[in-house]
Amino acid sequence: LEASEEMEQEPCLAPILEQQEQVLTVALGQPVRLCCGRTERGRHWYKEGSRLASAGRVRGWRGRLEIASFLPEDAGRYLCLARGSMTVVHNLTLLMDDSLTSISNDEDPKTLSSSSSGHVYPQQAPYWTHPQRMEKKLHAVPAGNTVKFRCPAAGNPMPTIHWLKDGQAFHGENRIGGIRLRHQHWSLVMESVVPSDRGTYTCLVENSLGSIRYSYLLDVLERSPHRPILQAGLPANTTAVVGSDVELLCKVYSDAQPHIQWLKHVVINGSSFGADGFPYVQVLKTTDINSSEVEVLYLRNVSAEDAGEYTCLAGNSIGLSYQSAWLTVLPEEDLTWTTATPEAASHHHHHH
């Protein structure tokens, strides 16, 4: 019998979770045999997007993934796809662990294989799979924001995750809005955080072989209320040709819901200002936008009458802010005409 046929007689392991991503740590030199579900037919293994050949040291053969002796270059993402539908049956990442090196003088390499309990061997205490995603320990977040803490881990048996707040079991039952525990993502999500959410959040990951924990510190910064802030330089002075389309932009930052108006300055009886000292304006557009969105005033097919000063006025419950820009409209024959008139300088104002 050829070696490949001998391997066929060996038991193989179906990865624990169908469709969900799974991470397995394999020792250098260790044989790997993984089945793809309960059937051998119509299943293909892929590594990093390339289908594995049915022969060789690493092969996809009769629905199973076989690695004769695990090498560093074998680490990576493996998918088992069902032929025809091409649905992902298994999504598996194999990592190399130098500390588990199998090849030694006094014992045979253990095979990553199945036992009567169906566990993956070697069994392993929990470990962090993506510690780089846990680098940020200290989180300072404005009130109202969403916070997500992640503790991506693996182990065998598959570990469980529990969350503590300030050392006590945390299920979010006393929190307005509750929490979302996404165990498959090893994450805790809190929406619309408030000052009472401040504290130390600890993920406790454990299986029968051990436990690991990591703590995040969360501080919630109370927002200082302020009138809308308009991005500098917007709206911008614009020059257009008669008949063209123009867009004037206004970017507004506001914690409280902002109310936006576009105004065009007009002249009445030869005057730009009324007796109260305020300019005469025509309201072109009124809108409510979400914070940090761009508000656009569209002017179609502009004519000479559209030239003039335009103002973006933003208000919220705290106050008003506005900034202005000039639109210059050129006749079609004057495409090269560019002059900097005194009034073409942008006017930027802020009012309470």
């Epitope: 680098e135 940020k136 320990k137 200290l138 989180h139 300072a140 000052p195 401040r198 130390t200 600890t202 690991i212 924990r213 990591y214 703590s215 510190l217 501080d219 919630v220 910064l221 109370e222």
Partner: antibody
Framework: EVQLLESGGGLVQPGGSLRLSCAAS????????MGWVRQAPGKGLEWVSV????????DYADSVKGRFTISRDNSKNTLYLQMNSLRAEDTAVYYC???????????WGQGTLVTVSS | QSELTQPPSASGTPGQRVTISCSGG????????AHWYQQLPGTAPKLLIY???QRPSGVPDRFSGSKSGTSASLAISGLRSEDEADYYC???????????FGGGTKLTVLG
């Protein structure tokens, strides 16, 4: 450029009080944990205290608990350390430090010397 | 009494490779990143290595860090006279809710 400038050090008698200040510039002060670390003459670094960004939570080394108070004024970009009931063993250079979100002190002040002696 | 343990001194000749060890417990080194600071004579400490093995900009690649379990180490290769300084390891300590430092290692560059 991040700058931390301590002031307020000096000579004080045992049992006396002193208030250290740390003026921060070159970065947005309010979202950072800030802390004090001290170094006695010829000795190693010792963590003293840390304050959370909002100022609502503070932590102290056992050696100063109950005697020192850390505070901050985010509107003035300033960190403070009020030191009461000073002892000879509090003699040290006191450093103000910005705490990076990963938990290390990524910027330090030049230090201010506090001498407790009769 | 420091929470993290370092050898008080280390030495080497120019061009040599020197390592400094640091050991702690689960609440600090075991469950958080290791960081290293360099303190040149008469100056404030300066961040040398953070997050176990990352170098801030401006730190030469002769300096490297590693961590395993509750122990960390700092390696300095191609030793130079200007490396003569005190080196401190540190880690956040979850039980203290603050950083904890090693006692420091005085590195001497011989002749």
């Amino acid at each position: 450029e991040v700058q931390l400038l301590e002031s307020g050090g000096g000579l004080v008698q045992p049992g006396g009080s002193l208030r250290l200040s740390c003026a921060a510039s070159g970065f947005t002060f309010s979202p950072y944990w800030m802390g004090w670390v001290r170094q006695a003459p010829g000795k190693g670094l010792e963590w003293v205290s840390v304050i959370w960004p909002s100022g609502g939570t503070t932590d102290y080394a056992d050696s100063v608990k109950g005697r020192f108070t850390i505070s901050r004024d985010n509107s003035k970009n300033t960190l403070y350390l009020q030191m009461n009931s000073l002892r000879a063993e509090d003699t040290a250079v006191y450093y103000c430090a910005r705490v990076h979100p990963a938990g290390h002190n990524d910027h330090w002040g030049q230090g201010t010397l506090v001498t407790v002696s009769s | 009494q420091s929470e993290l343990t370092q050898p008080p001194s280390a030495s080497g000749t120019p061009g040599q490779r020197v390592t400094i060890s640091c050991s702690g417990g689960y609440s600090n080194m075991g469950s958080n990143y290791a960081h290293w600071y360099q303190q040149l004579p008469g100056t404030a400490p300066k961040l040398l290595i953070y997050n176990n093995n990352q170098r801030p900009s401006g730190v030469p690649d002769r300096f490297s860090g590693s961590k395993s379990g509750t122990s960390a180490s700092l390696a300095i290769s191609g030793l130079r006279s200007e490396d003569e300084a005190d080196y401190y390891c540190a880690a956040w300590d979850d039980s203290l809710s603050g950083p904890v430092f090693g006692g420091g290692t005085k590195l001497t560059v011989l002749g």
